[in-house]
């Protein structure tokens, strides 16, 4: 123990205490007395900065007295006991309860000892993220929306994306007084490359142990992007049948495939099977441009491919087939 006369009593309390709107919170406050030090506590007092009078008093002989009896309660102080714990419980936290409070011990002979505590009134926000379905506008539009509702203080929203773009964040009063709803939009120029990709909304708030991550899968509606595959420029007479495939990317999905040639309908050796075109063996050279027309809800797009079946000697028996 410290030598006599050097130990001082100390009021211990956190500098800041968080509490949730509508909940109860305890403002902890304790008197730390060195082992050899004698002290007598006659009164505990809680007051709020900027307000005259005390909000809670516990007197050694008279017990507790509260400015708002239904909302305040000394947690541990009891008549007939040593008053070393001034912790005060507050019920039904309101926004206006946020502020600086002083916990004071009247001790003898050391005198009054106090400490200030900042009460933070928090409200835990509810977070949602949703896609904003768009078409190819050619200009920046919101493609995702992230909303943090009813936070106090306002939540902090950031976005993580490999697609480029920029956020547009706004605030509005929440449903409960003193709370804030934060809305953040992720804005970019829509393209077919963006469709199906994801962006992540990160919401940070004092009430969260760790940031909340909400992933949004983007939706961009666009007409079909069409190409034809399956031809390798080496098709010969007398080879096996071959297949051309109409490759289409679109959102929504294609509703129909239509095969034709630049000359009109398909020749007899070409048979359409949905996205595929079956080319049967031919006995004379051909030079035909095939057209695949793909339709979805937003429109139709087509691709062309010119196929030549040549006379040259088939050096391999693999035939016309490129698959």
């Amino acid at each position: 123990w410290p030598p006599p006369g050097t130990g001082d009593i100390i009021v211990q309390a956190p500098t800041q205490v968080p509490g949730f709107l509508g909940d109860s919170v305890t403002l902890p406050c304790y008197l730390q007395v060195p082992g050899m030090e004698e002290t007598h506590v006659s009164q505990l007092t809680w007051s709020r900065h900027g307000e005259s009078g005390s909000m809670a008093v516990f007197h050694q002989t008279q017990g507790p007295n509260y400015s708002e009896p239904k909302r305040l309660e000394f947690v541990a102080a009891r008549l007939g006991t040593e008053l070393r714990d001034a912790s005060l419980r507050m019920f039904g936290l309101r926004v206006e309860d946020e502020g600086n409070y002083t916990c004071l011990f009247v001790t003898f002979p050391q005198g009054s000892r106090s400490v200030d505590i900042w009460l933070r009134v928090l409200a835990k926000p509810q977070n949602t993220a949703e896609v904003q379905k768009v078409q190819l506008t050619g200009k920046p539009v919101p493609v995702a929306r992230c909303v943090s509702t009813g936070g106090r203080p306002p939540a902090h929203i950031t976005w993580h994306s490999d697609l480029g773009g920029m956020p547009n964040t706004s605030q509005a009063p929440g449903f409960l007084s003193g709370t804030v709803t934060v809305t953040s939009l992720w804005i970019l120029v829509p393209s077919s490359q963006v469709d199906g990709k994801s962006v992540t909304c990160k919401v940070e708030h004092e009430s969260f142990e760790k940031p909340q991550l909400l992933t949004v899968n983007l939706t961009v509606y666009y007409p079909p992007e069409v190409s034809i595959s399956g031809y390798d420029n080496n098709w010969y007479l007398s080879q096996n049948e071959a297949t051309l495939t109409c490759d289409a990317r679109s959102n929504p999905e294609p509703t129909g495939y239509n095969w034709s040639t630049t000359m009109g309908p398909l020749p007899p050796f070409a048979v359409a099977q949905g996205a595929q075109l079956l080319i049967r063996p031919v006995d004379k050279p051909i030079n035909t441009t095939f057209i695949c027309n793909v339709t979805n809800a937003l429109g139709a797009r087509q691709a062309e491919l010119t196929v030549q079946v040549k006379e040259g000697p088939p050096s391999e028996p693999s035939g016309m087939s490129s698959n």
Partner: antibody
């Protein structure tokens, strides 16, 4: 105004007990701390103990533990100090003093006029 | 056992300044010793002047001030008056008891 009025002088034989009273007026007695102090002839002042009038909580100078008892009577706003097993070196003027708060600090604010206790065979 | 030492006597001229000190045998006086100063005029009751090292009691003239001076407690009287002639006692707190100094007889001459 705040006043402490002590009982009159006492002459006691060695081994006897003495009870000195200190009547308070002019303030809320139950919220006060009262110390007892003595001054032997030709000697300095010596603190004996304090009592919190509201609850009777006490703190004694270890030198006097077991021989001294402090009490209060809140109905008459009076503090008492009883000293037992008196010896000749207990001969002294005994004072009660009320501690007052100045800002956040206590001080020996108001004193009684003193009670002379003589221990003699 | 802690011993509190004061100057046995000091003299000050009227209107002058004098500092009374209070030394502790256990080491430096600190705020934890809650230095108190009381005054006793001849034939009168004791009167409290200072509590908690430097806090004047209500009604105590501003010419009295308490402080820590080096390793001692001090009572400074600035602008001494004839009526300040008295015995002054320092009181220190040692964790569980008060200890009085021997007193300083102040003469205003």
């Amino acid at each position: 105004q705040v006043q402490l009025v002590q009982s009159g002088a006492e002459v006691k034989k060695p081994g006897a007990s003495v009870k000195v009273s200190c009547k308070a007026s002019g303030y809320t007695f139950t919220s006060s701390y009262i110390s007892w102090v003595r001054q032997a002839p030709g000697q300095g002042l010596e603190w004996i103990a304090w009592i919190y009038a509201g609850t009777g909580d006490t703190n004694y100078n270890q030198k006097f533990t077991g021989r001294v008892t402090m009490t209060t009577d809140t109905s008459t706003s009076t503090a008492y100090m009883e000293l037992r097993s008196l010896r000749s070196d207990d001969t002294a003027v005994y004072y009660c003093a009320r501690h007052g708060l100045t800002g956040r600090h206590w001080y020996f604010a108001v004193w009684g006029q003193g009670t002379t206790v003589t221990v003699s065979s | 056992q802690a011993v509190v030492t004061q100057e046995p006597s000091l003299t000050v001229s009227p209107g002058g300044t004098v500092t009374l000190t209070c030394r502790s045998s256990t080491g430096a006086v600190t705020t934890s010793n809650i230095a108190n100063w009381v005054q006793q005029k001849p034939g009168q009751a004791f009167r409290g002047l200072i509590g908690g090292t430097n806090n004047r009691g209500p009604g105590v003239p501003a010419r009295f001030s308490g402080s820590l001076l080096g390793d001692k407690a001090a009572l400074t009287l600035s602008g001494a008056q004839p009526e300040d002639e008295a015995e002054y006692y320092c009181i220190l707190w040692y964790s569980n008891k008060f200890v009085f100094g021997g007193g300083t007889k102040l003469t205003v001459l």
